[in-house]
């Protein structure tokens, strides 16, 4: 057992059929000796008296909010949390296996930039009863400071009979050099839970690693004369590193048809412009990506031909 | 060697093209290792990542771009102790810091040379003979040696009595192809920085 | 803050019925169990009925068989079905609402009340 927060406790248990369980002790937390009862979870039922309590917590039903009392009056409270260990694995219930980039991927993190400031979200098909604590760290030895916000509510999708609904956090790190080579990485560590159910996940990465940058901006078509070309220009988002001399970026402009079965023209380029063959009703995407380390390409910002 | 200032990209700085050949060498041969020892722990996940250069140079510092000095947490160590003049830059252009910054980018490259050619004597004594240093990464690493043209003392390539354990060798290749992939991208970056400046 | 808003209170005749509601809004977080409770003029307040978060509910001797307590989580609603109304269930009825929200920790929230009086 061990605590999660001021009066708020994680009862860690092998979860399998009549497993023994774990035995708790409970002490009120009052100078008071005598005339002390134990309830859970608001019920009138009592379950003990004195200023310790001894149970077996073996299933949820456990599990809850534990009050001593004194004469009608609240002394502490207790709440004990159940976290299932089946088959030498941690339970992972809460959370949806992404399966991106690999199985087991629970947490998925992304940075727009190299300025130490990255965003993860984590779906889950529950809808209430749910809470989440997010930490972060360069390092997990000699641990060195990230910063994150609250955990929100960021969209919620309809898949098939099911409702799945995803979660966010944004964190920065507190003292980042966007020029640095990174040697520690980044841990994330996100607490979850469900009713009385603890669970634990984590992520580990180099901002390096995680670098998406958002697409190009004010793209822009220049027809050329007595040609079917045109001039594409755009420019870097305005939220990548600077300065873009040293933070560059590489380019990737595609010509796509209406029809998806269309043949597509691809180009790659440096430079923050390109000439391509416009065809009728075709529309030209351009995305980018870290020049020097290739981490995840940008989503596509598109413009039509005509 | 010291090209005129009017001549066009990429002329101007020959060194850009040398680093971007450095980029596609290292990165080729990492992705040549990750291949051949996969079922060595030589994933970035899986290795621990060290720096031999550390505390010896400082060319993340000795290069920062003018626009990062302004950033506290960019500026831990701004002091090294080279302060040579190097010839890829036309010489009306180099400044005191570009100076050592590419007189710190030599000598990375002269430490992990040492290492690379340290590590592949020892693999090519391997049984297995199943991973060697790729020849155009060694090569390519001279080649941007050159065209910084630093003067420095020859640094004697390590060599050991005892029987080499090749196990722990292909690890630290993997260590050491990881580090310098990453100080290639750095080493890239700056290129590109100074070409504009 | 978790806020609750009590409502379905009224003046109904002995062997009458009334539901209660009570619903919560705010960042509610986990919810550990939820409570109804009452408290007649020049008494103290006294548990009802209550419900913890596996659903299991529990009752005061005096209502058990005419009280019933149910959740709908969807709606972050709680009920309090009250049938075969006496005289002696008069009182200002509050919800009660404990909670845990891991980035502040446990919280016990009450409603305003509603009052609920049974008179012929």
């Known amino acids: 057992i061990w605590e999660l927060k001021k009066d708020v406790y994680v009862v860690e248990l092998d979860w399998y059929p009549d497993a023994p369980g774990e035995m708790v002790v409970l002490t009120c937390d009052t100078p008071e000796e005598d005339g002390i009862t134990w309830t859970l979870d608001q019920s009138s039922e009592v379950l003990g008296s004195g200023k310790t309590l001894t149970i077996q917590v073996k299933e949820f039903g456990d599990a809850g909010q534990y009050t001593c009392h004194k004469g009608g009056e609240v002394l502490s409270h207790s709440l004990l949390l159940l976290h299932k260990k089946e088959d030498g694995i941690w339970s992972t219930d809460i959370l949806k296996d992404q399966k991106e980039p690999k199985n087991k991927t629970f947490l998925r993190c992304e940075a727009k930039n190299y300025s130490g400031r990255f965003t993860c979200w984590w779906l889950t098909t529950i809808s209430t009863d749910l809470t989440f604590s997010v930490k972060s760290s360069r390092g997990s030895s000699d641990p060195q400071g990230v910063t994150c916000g609250a955990a929100t509510l960021s969209a919620e999708r309809v898949r098939g009979d099911n409702k799945e609904y995803e979660y966010s956090v944004e964190c920065q790190e507190d003292s980042a050099c966007p020029a640095a080579e990174e040697s520690l990485p980044i841990e994330v560590m996100v607490d979850a839970v469900h009713k009385l159910k603890y669970e634990n996940y984590t992520s580990s990465f180099f901002i390096r690693d995680i670098i998406k940058p958002d697409p190009p901006k004010n793209l822009q078509l220049k027809p050329l004369k007595n040609s079917r070309q045109v001039e594409v220009s755009w420019e870097y988002p305005d939220t990548w590193s600077t300065p873009h001399s040293y933070f560059s970026l590489t380019f990737c402009v595609q010509v796509q048809g209406k029809s998806k079965r269309e043949k597509k023209d691809r180009v790659f380029t440096d430079k923050t412009s390109a000439t391509v063959i416009c065809r009728k009703n075709a529309s030209i995407s351009v995305r980018a990506q870290d020049r020097y380390y290739s981490s995840s390409w940008s989503e596509w910002a598109s413009v039509p031909c005509s | 060697r010291n090209l005129p200032v009017a001549t066009p990209d990429p002329g101007m700085f020959p060194c850009l093209h040398h680093s971007q050949n450095l980029l596609r060498a290292v990165s080729n041969m990492l992705q040549k290792a990750r291949q051949t020892l996969e079922f060595y722990p030589c994933t970035s996940e899986e290795i621990d990542h060290e720096d031999i250069t550390k505390d010896k140079t400082s060319t993340v510092e000795a290069c920062l771009p003018l626009e990062l000095t302004k950033n506290e947490s960019c500026l831990n160590s701004r002091e090294t102790s080279f302060i040579t003049n190097g010839s890829c830059l036309a010489s009306r252009k180099t400044s005191f810091m570009m100076a050592l910054c590419l007189s710190s980018i030599y000598e990375d490259l002269k430490m992990y040379q040492v290492e690379f050619k340290t590590m592949n004597a020892k693999l090519l004594m391997d049984p297995k003979r199943q991973i060697f240093l790729d020849q155009n990464m060694l090569a390519v690493i001279d080649e941007l040696m050159q065209a910084l043209n630093f003067n420095s003392e020859t640094v004697p390539q390590k060599s050991s009595l005892e029987e080499p354990d090749f196990y722990k060798t292909k690890i630290k290749l993997c260590i050491l192809l990881h580090a310098f992939r990453i100080r290639a991208v750095t080493i890239d970056r700056v290129m590109s920085y100074l070409n504009a400046s | 803050e978790v806020q609750l808003v009590e409502s379905g209170g009224g003046l109904v005749q002995p062997g009458g019925s009334l539901r209660l509601s009570c619903v919560a809004s705010?960042?509610?977080?986990?919810?550990?169990?939820t409570g109804w409770y009452r408290q007649a003029p020049g008494k103290q307040r006294d548990l009802v009925a209550s419900?913890?978060?596996?659903?299991?509910?529990n009752y005061q001797d005096s209502v058990k068989g005419r009280f019933t307590i149910s959740r709908d989580s969807a709606k972050n609603t709680v009920y309090l079905q009250m049938n075969s109304l006496k005289p002696e269930d008069t009182a200002v009825y509050y919800c009660?609402?404990?909670?845990?929200?891991?980035?502040?920790?446990?919280?016990?929230?009450w409603g305003q009340g509603t009052q609920v009086t049974v008179s012929s």
């Open positions: 705010g960042d509610i977080g986990s919810m550990t169990s």
């Open positions: 419900i913890n978060s596996g659903g299991r509910p």
């Open positions: 009660n609402l404990r909670g845990l929200v891991l980035s502040t920790g446990l919280y016990e929230s």
